[in-house]
């Protein structure tokens, strides 16, 4: 079971600084952006991270969303990240969902930020280079320290 | 760098109550747990129990279900463990430690340990 | 409650001596594991987390490895300061334990 308690307006980065952002197409891409551009593209750049309160603390669970012309909100569906066009819900009757991440830090490392899916034990938000693009997937934690599974979270408001 | 500093060590008889705070500093209070970790003398660790402030509610290990109640007042930054109906067998070193965001799956910071003695 | 087993109780080892510490699960944690050393008086010292992730500021001499149920501690040159006792925690449900620790004496 997991209840709604409060949402914060954040920007979240790769370990390279680059700039989570929801493109024309609602894809999750990363892109080096100055401070400027990250305001400038905004709402695009600006996700709203809505914490839960879990039956089992596992971590802060989490849904991210963003506010275009409508609430999207992330989901890992079949393990494919997309944003569907919902609000995050208030209550989420169930220990498992594709909205609901599992927001951990990293010891010592207050700002580094992991996201496992609450659907997928062992799968995480990470961020993956194709072709040009730099993009936002779910993937399997396999190697040690992988940085592309973690992420900085900059609080907005 | 987050500090946790814990109270002075204490004397009770046996049958009564203690209660012991953790002041942390340093770093963000309600969304990190706090849990309460005991060592009796000479033996291992052993956790109590712990809580997230955000969350209000605290969790507990099963053996001290009933007789721990853990605490937070995020205004002060600090946790509260009480220990209730005291045996000697209570007699031990009591640490705070600062776990992870929103759950207990590492302890990276912790205090430097109350002593409680439970003797008649 | 996941149960953690850890072999031996004590050893002794001399300096340089590599060194090994195993932790057994009840129950598969996956990579759920973190390995803590406490020097006598002290507050425990996050060492790895994860199994197999050297916390930062730790020795690269440290390291862990296993997943699933069997997990290792290894000391590969042991050093003065390495004489303490060593815990294994889990955390693959939220009701967190430690194993009973391994104390690793000076031989």
């Known amino acids: 079971y997991f209840g709604k308690l409060e949402s914060k307006l954040s920007v979240i980065r790769n370990l390279n600084d680059q700039v989570l952002f929801i493109d024309q197409g609602n894809r999750p891409l990363f892109e080096d952006m100055t401070d400027s551009d990250c305001r400038d593209n905004a709402p695009r750049t600006i996700f709203i991270i809505s914490m839960y309160k879990d039956s089992q603390p596992r971590g802060m669970a989490v849904t991210i969303s963003v506010k275009c012309e409508k609430i999207s909100t992330l989901s890992c569906e079949n393990k494919i990240i997309s944003f569907k066009e919902m609000n995050p819900p208030d209550n989420i009757k169930d220990t498992k969902s594709d909205i609901i991440f599992f927001q951990r830090s990293v010891p010592g490392h207050d700002n580094k930020m992991q996201f496992e899916s609450s659907s997928y034990e062992g799968y995480f938000l990470a961020c993956e280079k194709e072709r040009d693009l730099f993009k936002l997937i779910l993937k399997k934690e396999d190697e040690l320290g992988d940085r592309s599974i973690m992420f900085t979270v900059q609080n907005e408001d | 760098q987050v500090q946790l500093v814990q109270s002075g060590a204490e004397v009770k008889k046996p049958g009564s109550s203690v209660k012991v705070s953790c002041k942390a500093s340093?770093?963000?209070?309600?969304?990190?747990?706090i849990s309460w970790v005991r060592q009796a003398p000479g033996q291992g660790l052993e956790w109590m129990g712990g809580i997230i402030p955000i969350f209000g509610t605290a969790n507990y290990a099963q053996k001290f279900q009933g007789r721990v109640t853990i605490t937070a007042d995020e205004s002060t930054s600090t946790a509260y463990m009480e220990l209730s109906s005291l045996r000697s067998e209570d007699t031990a070193v009591y640490y705070c430690?600062?776990?992870?965001?929103?759950?207990?799956?590492?302890?990276?910071?912790w205090g430097q340990g109350t002593l409680v003695t439970v003797s008649s | 409650d996941i149960q953690m087993t850890q072999s031996p109780s004590s050893l002794s080892a001399s300096v340089g001596d590599r060194v090994t510490i195993t932790c057994r699960a009840s129950?598969?944690?996956?990579?759920?594991l973190n390995w803590y050393q406490q020097k006598p008086g002290k507050a425990p010292k996050l060492l790895i987390y994860?199994?197999?992730t050297l916390q930062s500021g730790v020795p690269s001499r440290f390291s862990g490895s296993g997943s699933g149920t069997d997990f290792t501690l290894t000391i590969s040159s042991l050093q003065p300061e390495d004489f303490a006792t060593y815990y294994c925690q889990q955390h693959k449900v939220w009701l967190t334990t430690f194993g009973q620790g391994t104390k690793v004496e000076i031989k």
């Open positions: 430690a600062r776990g992870g965001y929103g759950g207990y799956y590492y302890f990276d910071y």
């Open positions: 340093g770093g963000t209070f309600s969304t990190f747990s």
């Open positions: 129950q598969s944690i996956s990579n759920r």
């Open positions: 994860k199994g197999s």
